[in-house]
Interface confidence: low
Amino acid sequence: IIPVEEENPDFWNREAAEALGAAKKLQPAQTAAKNLIIFLGDGMGVSTVTAARILKGQKKDKLGPEIPLAMDRFPYVALSKTYNVDKHVPDSGATATAYLCGVKGNFQTIGLSAAARFNQCNTTRGNEVISVMNRAKKAGKSVGVVTTTRVQHASPAGTYAHTVNRNWYSDADVPASARQEGCQDIATQLISNMDIDVILGGGRKYMFRMGTPDPEYPDDYSQGGTRLDGKNLVQEWLAKRQGARYVWNRTELMQASLDPSVTHLMGLFEPGDMKYEIHRDSTLDPSLMEMTEAALRLLSRNPRGFFLFVEGGRIDHGHHESRAYRALTETIMFDDAIERAGQLTSEEDTLSLVTADHSHVFSFGGYPLRGSSIFGLAPGKARDRKAYTVLLYGNGPGYVLKDGARPDVTESESGSPEYRQQSAVPLDEETHAGEDVAVFARGPQAHLVHGVQEQTFIAHVMAFAACLEPYTACDLAPPAGTTD
């Protein structure tokens, strides 16, 4: 199934010449950025990007790798070193501190320098670091957070929270001793630390008092409110803001995003994380692309610009389950959101970055034929004379023994959305990986994204590009299209 034209050297020479021509025409934009968008693919290592590219291409009836993703079209790329101050292989909390605040932290802490210690409440005060989103708000921009996880989850929390424990979602998760020392849960910080204009994702249950039934699952007690302090945080958030609207389903989101009277929007579409894209009820829950579009509609009204954080947060969850199908379909929806945002914004005034917080021990190998299913089998057999999949994990729940040996696998099994790819080491959850991840950039000052950088560089590029603290004396021309 090799395309005939690809057998001809002219095909490759022509294709490369076009790419070279485009590269030669690249002109670094010397203006400041009016808008900042950071797209965060949680757990989206380079192997995930490659595999998702092939899957997306194959969904369009192509062979796969030749069709670029939306993120592939960003002209500038760098590598980001993701380690935490105390760990070679990081978590999503301390990495969020790095790419959102510009300072590295310790494993499982958020919005704190490395002087703060995991789970030690009394090390919080004085060690807070301020996110670029917070700085953008102080500069008069509108700001938004969009995620497929809980809005209180580690990555989105990096935009607004300061906590020594990323798992302190609601006050019920915070030990009494820490509460007495004044440490606040992440949900409380969401509504009180700063004024966020758009908040979209999951995480309803952390906002309401214990015993409050969930509107979508009123008969399931486990999905109801978790708070012990009796607070209704959504109501408090609404009460503080003129023009605030709360929604919990797709229909209400679409209506609110078109309503000119809505100035602040909180949409929480699931009690916890949002459903995987393959399980999403499209009548009730919006997709990441739809949430991104709704956020951009509201944020774009501000003449001073906006900061938007968009997370494909469940790429990571799919990998932790060793279910590549879930991880890759989440990555494709993430890429769709990037594509839609590109249609709704201009690279003349918007700096868009795409990156991952960390990678996963997810591999793609075995010499599969071009055009064969990304979820398929390698052409040959392993030494145990059994088939193996081209996608595998170094560790995780996919390690299973059948009669003391590695089980055989068929193409129909491996193609199932529920299939767990095999791994070398048995773990309840597959782990993150420590290799560098890609950073893709487009728009004003995107040319600064080059080489191999610390993950913290990302936050500094955004701050500099928009002339935010500590780069208010950035000496950049005003963003394209502005008059002041």
């Epitope: 008092r209 009796g230 209704n232 109501q235 408090e236 009460a239």
Partner: antibody, heavy 123, light 106 residues
């Protein structure tokens, strides 16, 4: 379980005053907007007054028909809502309900109601 | 002040019928409308809030729709226990109730 119990109603002469109480239980009283609504015999519902929650400094609002005569207040330590009614008129005869804002997300929609207390203004 | 005009003031329908009540606001209320059911001698009961959101525990035969100034409340298949008076409430700008619709069985 959310419970609202009104009391203080009864027969009162025109021009006199009366104070209604609404004792709340089963929820964190300070977190919720509270309102008074009345219903004259055989008539529809009429909203009278609102007192907001702790997050908004317990600010108050009134309908034009009672502004200046009625005062809404709350004793947060006892979880009691009050309606002080002065210069009563015969047209104030009604069942008076206290109502609590939504269990859910919009702090203003009236989701929980007491059983009502009857106020009769007559000479 | 926002005024709410509810119609009809009364209606008679048979069990199984589709019943529709409308409320018109004097200005855009941004979908902040709720619908209540009240039976004689009882307090009102919230059925629907924010135009179309069904309060938990309320049967799915009750629904709401609308935007701007025009809103509709529907009972898809009237049941004997639905006999009551129904009120709309706007809560965009403080509160205003509609005049009520008394629903009877034919």
């Amino acid at each position: 379980e959310v419970q609202l119990v009104e009391s203080g109603g009864g027969l009162v002469q025109p021009g006199r005053s009366l104070r209604l109480s609404c004792t709340a239980s089963g929820f964190t009283f300070t977190d919720y907007y509270m309102s008074w609504v009345r219903q004259a015999p055989g008539k529809g519902l009429e909203w009278l007054a609102l007192i907001r929650n702790k997050a908004t400094g317990y600010t108050t609002e009134y309908s034009a028909s009672v502004k200046g005569r009625f005062t809404i207040s709350r004793d947060n330590s006892k979880s009691i809502l009050y309606l002080q009614m002065n210069s009563l008129k015969t047209e104030d005869t009604a069942v008076y309900y206290c109502a609590r804002a939504s269990f859910y997300y919009d702090g203003k929609v009236l989701a929980y109601w007491g059983q009502g207390t009857l106020v009769t203004v007559s000479s | 002040d926002t005024q709410m005009t509810q119609s009809p003031s009364s209606l008679s329908a048979s069990v199984g019928d589709r019943v529709t009540i409308t409320c018109q606001a004097s200005q855009d209320i941004n979908k902040y409308i709720a619908w209540y059911q009240q039976k004689p001698g009882k307090a009102p009961k919230l059925l629907i809030y924010y135009t179309s959101s069904l309060q938990p525990g309320v049967p799915s035969r009750f629904s709401g729709s609308g935007s701007g100034t025009d809103y509709t409340f529907t009972i898809s298949s009237l049941q004997p226990e639905d006999i009551a008076t129904y009120y709309c409430l706007q809560y965009d700008n403080l509160y205003t109730f509609g005049q009520g619709t008394k629903l009877e069985i034919k």
